[in-house]
Amino acid sequence: PEPPTACREKQYLINSQCCSLCQPGQKLVSDCTEFTETECLPCGESEFLDTWNRETHCHQHKYCDPNLGLRVQQKGTSETDTICTCEEGWHCTSEACESCVLHRSCSPGFGVKQIATGVSDTICEPCPVGFFSNVSSAFEKCHPWTSCETKDLVVQQAGTNKTDVVCGPQDRLRA
């Protein structure tokens, strides 16, 4: 571990003296002196500072721009930033969630492995043998082929990854 520095935790060194840092939610107005304590002021409306600090300006809360498909997930406080998320059907383009894009749909032959959230896109997977998807969808999984046998029917047309099997009546001429 690093050896301890001249000033303690939640202090900073300035002009040969240790001054108290300002607590989260407050900004520095003036450093301490030999005779006075550090002077701090609360951040204003729509501002925040989330650490013990010596910042002279608070940070502005993030703006969730509806024109970019964003909405407020969690309102900011003097100690926390606003958290944005995307409108229904959309997801963030980055971890910082600065803009949104429409959820991707899975093409025919692919099914939804994981439904999209506000922060992650749809994950598609190819339909394996025995399953199909005949629609472009952001919700539909691959469906299993119909089991003709359980309906006392026979396969008339084989299924693919995009189509279901076609069942038909048993050939009655067969012994």
Epitope: A6, R8, S16, E34
Partner: antibody, heavy 116, light 107 residues
Framework: QVQLVQSGAEVKKPGSSVKVSCKAS????????IEWVRQAPGQGLEWMGV????????NYNEKIKDRVTLTADKSTSTAYMELSSLRSEDTAVYYC?????????WGQGTLVTVSS | DIQLTQSPSSLSASVGDRVTITCRAS??????LNWYQQKPGKTIKLLLN???RLHSGVPSRFSGSGSGTDFTFTISSLQPEDIATYYC?????????FGGGTKVEIK
């Protein structure tokens, strides 16, 4: 009144170590940082490091941090500066000073001569 | 490291003259600048801290101004006892650094 009294002059051989003391009086020793500064003959002032006598925590000048150790004894209100692996260019007057908005009070200085 | 450039390096003035020394920092140091006086064979003294605050017991003929990167130290009326070397020092960012010094002499 605030006073910082340093130990006497030293003559040292290259490669050896020196320990300079700085006894403080006239104020609460633990409440102020102690700074160390040196001045080579005919040269300007060079900051060496700072110690918090209350916590024992310190910061050093990167140029000499591997060779300098600052300590403080609260029971005697004395700060110490030890410099090891001495070389001829360490010949200087070594000063301690009290912090608190600049180096507010200075010791009288300790001449350390490094010579073979 | 923050460099402090002090000028002039030496000056000669008459008793009663106004003497001005400048100190320029290589980057913004706000008002964390201190001025010291070093007389031969005497303890170094703090004259001004935070660029312009007179330290206790220092005569009012000494003054300072400036903020950011440019600072000025003034002796309004030079006295014989002011013969000394004067240093600026920044307390903004470690490592603390000093100017090269200005030697003041009497004509």
């Amino acid at each position: 009144q605030v006073q910082l009294v340093q130990s006497g002059a030293e003559v040292k051989k290259p490669g050896s170590s020196v320990k300079v003391s700085c006894k403080a009086s006239g104020y609460a020793f633990s409440d102020y940082l102690i700074e160390w500064v040196r001045q080579a003959p005919g040269q300007g002032l060079e900051w060496m490091g700072v110690i918090n006598p209350g916590s024992g925590g310190s910061n050093y000048n990167e140029k000499i941090k591997d060779r300098v150790t600052l300590t403080a004894d609260k029971s005697t209100s004395t700060a110490y500066m030890e410099l090891s692996s001495l070389r001829s260019e360490d010949t200087a007057v070594y000063y301690c000073a009290r912090g608190g908005g600049g180096f507010t009070y200075w010791g009288q200085g300790t001449l350390v001569t490094v010579s073979s | 490291d923050i460099q402090l450039t002090q000028s002039p390096s030496s000056l000669s003035a008459s008793v009663g003259d106004r003497v001005t020394i400048t100190c320029r920092a290589s980057q913004d140091i706000s008002n964390y600048l201190n001025w010291y006086q070093q007389k031969p064979g005497k303890t170094i003294k703090l004259l001004l801290n935070f660029a312009s605050r007179l330290h206790s017991g220092v005569p009012s003929r000494f003054s300072g101004s400036g903020s950011g990167t440019d600072f000025t130290f003034t002796i309004s009326s030079l006295q014989p006892e002011d013969i000394a070397t004067y240093y600026c020092q920044q307390g903004s960012t470690l490592p603390w650094t000093f100017g090269g010094g200005t030697k003041v002499e009497i004509k």
